[in-house]
Interface confidence: low
């Protein structure tokens, strides 16, 4: 069971300092941006991280949403990352959900975060280069210290 607590506005970056944004096709991508670019591209660069109380504490349970014309929430259905047009629900009556991730700091690096899927244990949000795009994907943790699954989260409130 997950019960919604508070939400905060955040900018999410990979460890190459590329900014996560949602493009016109609703795809989550990373791109080099100055602070000015990041502001100019809002709200596509501003993510609503909603925190949830977890009946089985396993880390900070969160959803990641973005509000452009409508609110879309990040999902990892079938281990595929996509934004689905939906509000983060107030309650989720299950021990896992495609939209719930466990946000945890990287041991020894309090400012670096990992997001593990609640549906797919051992799978984390990651940045992966595909041709000329840097995409947000779900991947299994292959090795300790894998930088692709580490992010910084900067609160904008």
């Amino acid at each position: 069971y997950f019960g919604k607590l508070e939400s905060k506005l955040s900018v999410i970056r990979n460890l190459n300092d590329q900014v996560l944004f949602i493009d016109q096709g609703n795809r989550p991508l990373f791109e080099d941006m100055t602070d000015s670019d990041c502001r100019d591209n809002a709200p596509r660069t501003i993510f609503i991280i909603s925190m949830y109380k977890d009946s089985q504490p396993r880390g900070m349970a969160v959803t990641i949403s973005v509000k452009c014309e409508k609110i879309s929430t990040l999902s990892c259905e079938n281990k595929i990352i996509s934004f689905k047009e939906m509000n983060p629900p107030d309650n989720i009556k299950d021990t896992k959900s495609d939209i719930i991730f466990f946000q945890r700091s990287v041991p020894g690096h309090d400012n670096k975060m990992q997001f593990e899927s609640s549906s797919y244990e051992g799978y984390f949000l990651a940045c992966e280069k595909e041709r000329d795009l840097f995409k947000l994907i779900l991947k299994k943790e292959d090795e300790l210290g894998d930088r692709s699954i580490m992010f910084t989260v900067q609160n904008e409130d």
Partner: antibody
């Protein structure tokens, strides 16, 4: 190379519970990253995904079977199991266990040879 | 649920000919999350293609996949005797995971 082998009774009485076990060899079920899957094929028909499980016990079920379905895992025996309750003739099928390839998406690179389960009185 | 429709149901061809198999989704399989399998009588399916066009390990290059959105194609450039089998497409974009009904490639 990973190998999967299904085992269990080939004949089940209507309204009873169908129970199958898949034994994995050539690799550890707890190595992580892979979801262990059950798929069935009705005689002369196409394939139907039943559900899958992670080594930790986390499961994902086909909604059409969810109310009757339990998939479990025993890492000490390197096995995972399927239980389908209240079976009917429509559950007669070849049941396959399989391993998903890992990474993004759910598709299967290793399969058992399949076992035919007939539901009949 | 995404329903996959395969056509034709049966394809009668001779060895050496080109086979073109179609798989159509009831809605878009976005980002191309589609796989193809080959199944021979009495055997389990064998993964051929995933990600629309990526050949699985050990699959010969006469097998190729293409398509996007709702329309996907598996092409066998020159049929070998061992290629006569049933072929299934499978989507892993939406839940539940679903398969097409299959296309049988038989010897003419």
């Amino acid at each position: 190379e990973v190998q999967l082998q299904e085992s269990g009774p080939g004949l089940v009485t209507p309204s009873q519970t169908l129970s199958l076990t898949c034994t994995v060899s050539g690799g550890s079920i707890s190595s992580g990253g892979h979801y262990w899957t059950w798929i069935r094929q009705h005689p002369g028909k196409g394939l139907e995904w039943i559900g899958y499980i992670y080594y930790s016990g986390s499961t994902y079920y086909n909604p059409s079977l969810k109310s009757r379905l339990t998939i479990s895992v025993d890492t000490s025996k390197n096995q995972f199991s399927l239980k389908l309750s209240s079976v009917a003739a429509a559950d007669t099928a070849v049941y396959y266990c399989a391993r998903d390839r890992g990474g993004s998406g759910s598709y299967w690179d290793y399969w058992g040879q399949g076992t035919l389960v007939t539901v009949s009185s | 649920e995404i329903v996959l429709t395969q056509s034709p149901g049966t394809l009668s061809l001779s060895p050496g000919e080109r086979a073109t198999l179609s798989c159509r989704g009831s809605r878009s399989v976005s980002s191309g999350y589609l796989a193809w399998y080959q199944q021979k009588p009495g055997q389990a399916p064998r993964l051929l293609i995933y990600g629309v066009s990526i050949r699985a390990t050990g699959i010969p290059d006469r097998f190729s996949g293409s398509g996007s959105g709702t329309d996907f194609t598996l092409t066998i450039s020159r049929l070998e005797p061992e290629d006569f089998a049933v072929y299934y497409c499978q989507q892993y974009h939406g839940s539940p995971l679903t398969f097409g009904g299959g296309t049988k490639v038989e010897i003419k």
